[in-house]
């Protein structure tokens, strides 16, 4: 109540950037704080299917988008079948994941290498026996898995015959995909993760062309886009609530990312409505609708009126509150190239405090599960990620501080990434593992970096001890 | 080159105690787990557990517990399997065996073996 | 606890022969399996991994295979060096079992 008599702000995200330290919730003084993370706090690490599995024409699997762009797209890359193959080497997967720790693991199904054409008819068996697997291991080394249904890799054929996201047809198709995981793995999962970063599927696959399909230049699909993957992951959710959730007892959100930004002069009214712009250009178009009032934030309605699709009253209705939990990323992908038009002239910053900060005060201090965060390093490091355990420790500290002197309901961390693997647009020329691969090698053995020990000291310790 | 050398044959009574090291070289054992198999005179092999090193845990085949328990000294590169109330039983050769982390749970490199008699 | 059963005790081939070794673990073990060689006096050693890889450094006349709960070590043309006693493991879960091995001998 303060903040918005005081702020004017009517209690949004732009509090955030007020540096009267009688009104800010972020308080800078704080810069390291030595202390544990909650009772309970759910350690976990990440990867997405196309990026370590490999083996993307093995064993009946569909081509993606993704496979078609690599070899259309991206020259210099041969493909993902060398990666890190995960699919054939799953064990040293759950090895690594055994030696680190961690209370979860957060992978991505391959929607094409359970259904090739993306329909959901008969489910190729071998598919279906790796996942089913990884999840056995998984539930055997008590290791919560957090399953993602759609982390980019979609079934070519529905881009060739659909149009991909742009045609409404898909939202159907994507809701039978996630019923028959539901009937298959709804036993051993417990967390659900619909769409991993909807902003980065329709801006750079639509907008710069940068991710597959490749389309670029027109905003009307890139808007349609997210309009449609919005409505995708609330059919899921309503769909879960309504047949799975009574006997599976599980929870259901969709990944949603995000860069921060601070204004360039810290008391201009205008450089701080930019930056509040900015973040509901990016984060605000995707949880407003599910996270805030049902629809797209105000300022992108009056803005993008031509463009942006309208929810009817009853849509609205539909999509408010189908998370049941706030799952956020935060790392390279949102900040490197990032949208100038977001970026509206404003100083970008790594500053995840604050980003969950904004979070808490737009959208009623949530449950946040931190679902990606780490950063990167050039492909030459090999286990010596000296950078790596820097922005790790900087992120946790945020997130510690967050937790402790903002009270963030944080309940979870990703550490992104299991392995070294295929970094989108970037290829194999960035490495974001925690464990090293050498993509050249039969074998690929996964060499825990210092990154790795170091993570793994954190879950000993539940945080940073003096 | 990756070695993991044990420490020599014993004779001990029945009723006591006795600690085995298994010291590795070529590799951090920090980075990897530390598996310690049995096998008794003309018997097949029996895992009796493991440790990873870098934080102590442990995981034990519970017809082991109690009778065995493994530790591990990161500072000098060693792994320790300790057997207690030793019986005739107990006579045996005990292996440490490891692998390189990211090549799953197999075990490809081995200890030559410390063979420890229990006698009266 | 998942049991290991290595039915033949004993395997008595002739040289440059085909031997067969069978392992039946008694629940799904999803080619989470090694076998191993042991030779007299000596530490065994990892010959194959994944019920069918073949690990650096061991000749390609051994090879592995199965699924669910049956594996097969194959070696196809038997050599001197090859008498051992032959161990299967699962690794699927703890405790890890091993089979109770199969002796092979020169016929």
């Known amino acids: 109540i303060l903040l918005r008599a005081v702020t004017g702000f009517s209690g949004d995200g732009r509090a955030i950037w007020s540096k009267n330290p009688n009104f800010t919730p972020v308080n800078e003084s704080q810069l390291f704080l030595y202390d544990t993370f909650p009772k309970n706090f759910f350690w976990g690490i990440g990867t997405g299917a196309l990026q370590v599995e490999g083996s993307w024409k093995k064993d009946g699997k569909g081509p993606s988008i993704w496979d078609h762009f690599i070899h259309t797209h991206l020259k210099n890359v041969s493909s993902t079948n060398g990666s890190s193959d995960s699919y054939i080497f799953l064990e040293k997967d759950l090895s690594a994941l055994d030696f680190i720790g961690v209370s979860f693991y957060q992978f991505s199904i391959s929607w094409p290498r359970l259904f090739p054409d993306g329909i959901v008819t008969v489910a190729n068996a071998k598919g279906l026996q790796y996942y089913s697997t990884l999840l056995d291991a998984l539930v055997l080394r008590n290791i919560e898995p957090i399953v993602t249904l759609y982390h980019w890799d979609l079934p070519l054929a529905l881009q060739e015959k659909y149009g991909g996201w742009k045609n409404d047809t898909i939202i159907d198709i994507f809701n039978d995909y996630a019923t028959y995981c539901f009937q298959m793995f709804g036993d051993r999962v417990k967390y659900w993760i619909t769409i991993h970063n909807p902003y980065l599927v329709a801006w750079h696959g639509y907008g710069t062309g940068m991710h597959a399909p490749g389309e670029k230049g027109n905003l009307a699909a890139v808007y349609t886009v997210g309009h449609n993957l919005i409505k995708a992951h609330s059919k899921v959710w309503h769909n879960y609530n309504t047949h799975f959730r009574p006997h599976q007892k599980g929870w259901l959100s969709i990944t949603l990312g995000s860069h921060w930004i601070e204004p360039n002069r810290s008391e201009n009214t205008m450089d701080i409505f930019k930056c509040q712009q900015s973040m509901v250009s990016v984060l605000g178009w995707f949880a407003n609708p599910i996270h805030g009032d049902g629809d797209y934030p105000e300022g992108m309605r009056k803005k993008l009126f031509s463009v942006l699709p309208i929810f009817s009253e009853a849509e609205k209705h539909e999509m408010r509150g189908t998370a049941d939990f706030f799952a956020f990323s935060f790392g390279p992908n949102n900040f490197k190239p990032l949208n100038t038009m977001a970026k509206m002239g404003q100083n970008v910053s790594l500053n995840l405090r604050e980003a969950l900060n904004w979070i808490k005060l737009e959208y009623n201090n949530p449950r946040i599960l931190i679902a990606e965060n780490g950063w990167f390093t050039d492909s030459r490091v090999k286990t010596e990620d000296t950078t790596a355990i820097y922005m790790m420790k900087n992120f946790l500290s945020q997130v510690l501080q967050a937790i402790r002197l903002d009270e963030i309901r944080v309940f979870g961390y990703t550490a992104w990434s299991l392995l070294d693997g295929f970094e989108w647009q970037d290829a194999y020329t960035i490495r974001r593992g925690l464990f090293y691969v050498d993509f050249n090698s039969k074998q690929k053995e996964r060499k825990p970096k210092s990154s790795a020990h170091y993570y793994k000291q954190i879950i000993r310790e539940n945080g940073f001890s003096l | 080159e990756v070695q993991l050398q044990q420490s020599g044959a014993e004779l001990l009574k029945p009723g006591a105690s006795v600690r085995l090291s298994c010291t590795a070289s070529?590799?951090?054992?920090?980075?990897?787990?530390t598996h310690w198999v049995r096998q008794r005179p003309e018997q097949g092999l029996e895992w009796i557990g493991r440790?990873?090193?870098?934080?102590?845990?442990?995981k034990y085949d519970p017809k082991f517990q109690g009778k065995a328990k493994i530790l591990a000294d990161t500072s000098s590169n060693t792994a320790y399997l300790q057997l207690i109330g030793l019986t005739s039983e107990d006579t045996a050769v005990y292996y440490c065996?490891?692998?390189?982390?990211?090549?799953?749970?197999?075990?490809?490199?081995w200890g030559q073996g410390t063979s420890v008699t229990v006698s009266s | 606890d998942i049991q290991m059963t290595q039915s033949s005790s004993y395997l008595s081939v002739s040289l440059g022969g085909r031997v067969t070794i069978t392992c039946k673990a008694s629940?799904?073990?999803?080619?989470?399996l090694a076998w191993y060689q042991q030779k007299p006096g000596n530490a065994p050693r990892l010959l194959i991994s994944?019920?069918?890889n073949l690990e650096t450094g061991i000749p390609s006349r051994f090879s592995g295979s199965g699924s669910g709960k049956d594996y097969t070590l194959t070696i196809t043309s038997l050599q001197t060096e090859d008498v051992a006693t032959y161990y299967c493991?699962?690794?699927?879960?703890?405790?890890?079992?091993f089979g109770s091995g199969t002796k092979l001998e020169i016929k």
């Open positions: 065996a490891s692998r390189a982390l990211g090549n799953g749970y197999a075990m490809d490199y």
């Open positions: 070529g590799f951090n054992i920090q980075d990897t787990f």
């Open positions: 440790i990873d090193p870098s934080n102590g845990n442990t």
């Open positions: 629940d799904h073990i999803n080619n989470w």
């Open positions: 994944g019920a069918s």
């Open positions: 493991q699962q690794y699927w879960n703890t405790p890890f079992t």
